[in-house]
Structures are given as C-alpha cells and as structure tokens.
C-alpha cells in the first residue's frame, strides 16, 4: 500500500513509463514527406511524458521496448481516391541518429482512406521517429482520425 501511494506521487517519467500521444500539426513543404506532430494538454487528448518533440518529430528519452502506434486518415478521400492516387504510403522509422536509421512500419493505402498499425520495437535515448507520408494525398488533421504515439513497455 505504501508503494502504491509512493507511485501515485511520482511523475510517470521517473517510473520509466514514458508515453506520448500526438496529433497532426501540419505536413511538410513540398519535397519533405514528413508529418509534423504536436502534443500537450492545451491541445486536448494529446500529451508527452518523457519523450519530447523536436521540430515536430518525436524524440525518445529513455531506452526500452516501446509500443509504437499510428493511425492516418486521408482528408479528401472516398473509397477509390486512394487507388486513383496509388501509391500513397505511410512509413514510420528512426530517422536520427543516422547510424540507427531504420524503417519500423510501412503501410499502403490501397482501397481505403485510413490505415492504422502498431508494433513493439526497441528504442534508445536520442532516437527520433519520423513519419513519412508519400504520395499526393493529404492527411486529415481531425484528432480522432490521425494520431501517433509511443508507450514504454519494458527496459
């Protein structure tokens, strides 16, 4: 019981429970396929406890195994729009440091306007996650349609 009380008084970060849930801020300029994210209580249901945003990209502050999840909905889209603009692809990966650059998730919009996925993956302090949307379709900024997050699971 004393442990439970102590837990409640400690911030999540100090327990290693790093977690972030982000909403889309904007897309990049024309030759930049990255999505730029934002988070914080002032924005509603988004937050950062541990990880931080660096120019709209999520940077990890604690080593560990994380659950990474993402959903992206295309904004001006109906059943066949995505197929008429094929290929539209979403990729999540470690984009810096360059020595750790790797793709973690790759998804294609084929017949639908929404894609969602998650996976467990080891991440290290200093890893920056980038989400690249390639193709000509734009993502929705509605917070229930497009979101991105990570959750520390274990060391």
């Amino acid at each position: 019981q004393r442990f439970a009380q102590a837990q409640q008084q400690l911030p999540l970060e100090s327990l290693g429970w790093d977690v972030a849930e982000l909403q889309l801020n904007h897309t990049g300029p024309q030759q930049d396929p990255r999505l730029y994210w934002q988070g914080g209580p002032a924005l509603g249901r988004s937050f950062l406890h541990g990880p931080e945003l660096d120019k709209g990209q999520l940077r990890i502050h604690r080593d560990g195994i994380y659950m990474v999840h993402i959903q992206v909905t295309l904004a001006i889209c109906s059943s066949t729009t995505a197929s008429r603009h094929h290929p539209t692809t979403l990729a999540v990966g470690i984009c810096s440091p360059a020595s750790r650059s790797i793709s973690l998730l790759r998804l294609s919009f084929h017949q639908g306007c929404t894609i969602a996925s998650q996976r467990l993956t080891p991440l290290a302090r200093g890893d920056t996650l980038c989400t690249n949307l390639t193709g000509t379709l734009l993502p929705s900024r509605n917070t229930d349609e497009t979101f991105f997050g990570v959750q520390w699971v274990r060391p």
Partner: antibody
Framework: QVQLVESGGGVVQPGRSLRLSCAAS????????MHWVRQAPGKGLEWVAV????????YYADSVKGRFTISRDNSKNTLYLQMNSLRAEDTAVYYC???????????WGQGTLVTVSS | EIVLTQSPATLSLSPGERATLSCRAS??????LAWYQQKPGQAPRLLIY???NRATGIPARFSGSGSGTDFTLTISSLEPEDFAVYYC?????????FGGGTKVEIK
C-alpha cells in the same frame, strides 16, 4: 440523372457577403467529394474549394482562404459556399462540381454569376 | 503551385482536320491530368482523365497522351460540335490547377 443546380448569385458591393447553394440530385450526394470552381468573365477556370464527403475536411485556394467557407448538408443534398469580404476580383461564374473520386470533375452545374461591384 | 501552360492559345482549323493541343506542367504530374471541353455559355465537360482515359460517353475521336510534364489532346477529325475551348487540369497537388485554355475555332 445527375443534376447540380447552383443558386444565390447576384450583384454585391465590395466587402459584403453572399452565400451560394448547389442542390444535388440523381446520385448519393453524401458519398461524394464536392468542389467549387469559378470562371471570371472571358477567363479560364480556377479551382476554389473542396469538401470531403462527410464535411469534416476542407481545402481552399489561397486567393479565397480566410474569406470563403465551403460546407454541405447531406440531409438536404446541398453544397454551400459562404463568401465574405468580397472583392472585385471575385467576380465570376461559380460552378459546383462533383469529384470523380480522384480530384477531377465529372459533373458540373450550370453556374451562378457573382458580380462584385460598387 | 503547379502551373499548366497550354498551347497554342488559338487553333484555327476546318471540320475534318486533326487538332493537336498541348499542355505542359511546371513539374511532373505523373499521369494525373484531365482534359475538359467548354462551349460558350455552358459548363465544362470532362473528356479525358488520367492523361489517356476517355470519360463516359466521349467519342473515340478524342484521345489523350503523355506523362510527366508534357501532354497532348488529339481530336482525330474535327466535327462541327468540337469547336470550343479546351482546358487541362492537374490533380497531383493542391491547389488543383487548370491551364489557360486553347480555343479551337473554325478556319
């Protein structure tokens, strides 16, 4: 058959507002992306705005951003364009157009003329 | 924004002749280009989509070709009802943009 009928055009002074409507029939309106496209007298076509099938996502041409608002009422099968702070350069025939599901336009209304003049 | 340049501005031809209209994009639009026909006092009509596909009900004398930045609309043998203004339109990037138009007039 597919029909799009615009209304609401007319003569208006600079700085004033106008709301255009487009009544749709002959297809399942709520399933389609819709656009407004305009054409100044004797000039070419200019895309103005687009709205998603559910009305939750919209994009605008830079020339009208912050002044025009596209909306739709799927229960009434009607598309709208609210035009505020009108300028002389907004004078044009305004067409509503149905999207092909790929950002080109397979059906157009007959157009409604908006004249902005003092 | 992507700029579409159409040429020539005016094409003077006789019925039965072949018409070749050009549309050039300021950057690649892949094959995401459409062509429209507009007659005086009427709304535009979709002729060709995705550079080379004829829209429903469009006669076979209309054909489109090209990809990347250079596109062509060909009318193999002009009928009297084909004299009109023709516009190209790209759907690769927002804002969607149209070319300035080519007027096909009777010589």
């Amino acid at each position: 058959q597919v029909q799009l009928v615009e209304s609401g055009g007319g003569v208006v002074q600079p700085g004033r507002s106008l709301r255009l409507s487009c009544a749709a029939s002959g297809f399942t309106f709520s399933s389609y992306i819709m656009h407004w496209v305009r054409q100044a007298p004797g000039k070419g076509l200019e895309w103005v705005a687009v709205i998603s099938y559910d009305g939750r996502n919209k994009y605008y041409a830079d020339s009208v951003k912050g002044r025009f608002t596209i909306s739709r009422d799927n229960s009434k099968n009607t598309l709208y364009l609210q035009m505020n702070s009108l300028r002389a350069e907004d004078t044009a025939v305004y067409y509503c157009a149905r999207d092909t599901d790929g950002y080109d336009f397979d059906y157009w209304g007959q157009g409604t003329l908006v004249t902005v003049s003092s | 924004e992507i700029v579409l340049t159409q040429s020539p501005a005016t094409l003077s031809l006789s019925p039965g002749e072949r018409a070749t209209l050009s549309c050039r994009a300021s950057q690649s639009v892949s094959s995401y280009l459409a062509w429209y026909q507009q007659k005086p006092g009427q709304a535009p009509r979709l002729l060709i989509y995705d550079a080379s596909n004829r829209a429903t009900g469009i006669p076979a004398r209309f054909s489109g070709s090209g990809s990347g930045t250079d596109f062509t609309l060909t009318i193999s043998s002009l009928e009297p009802e084909d004299f009109a203004v023709y516009y190209c339109q790209q759907r690769t990037n927002w804002p969607l943009t149209f070319g300035g138009g080519t007027k096909v007039e009777i010589k």
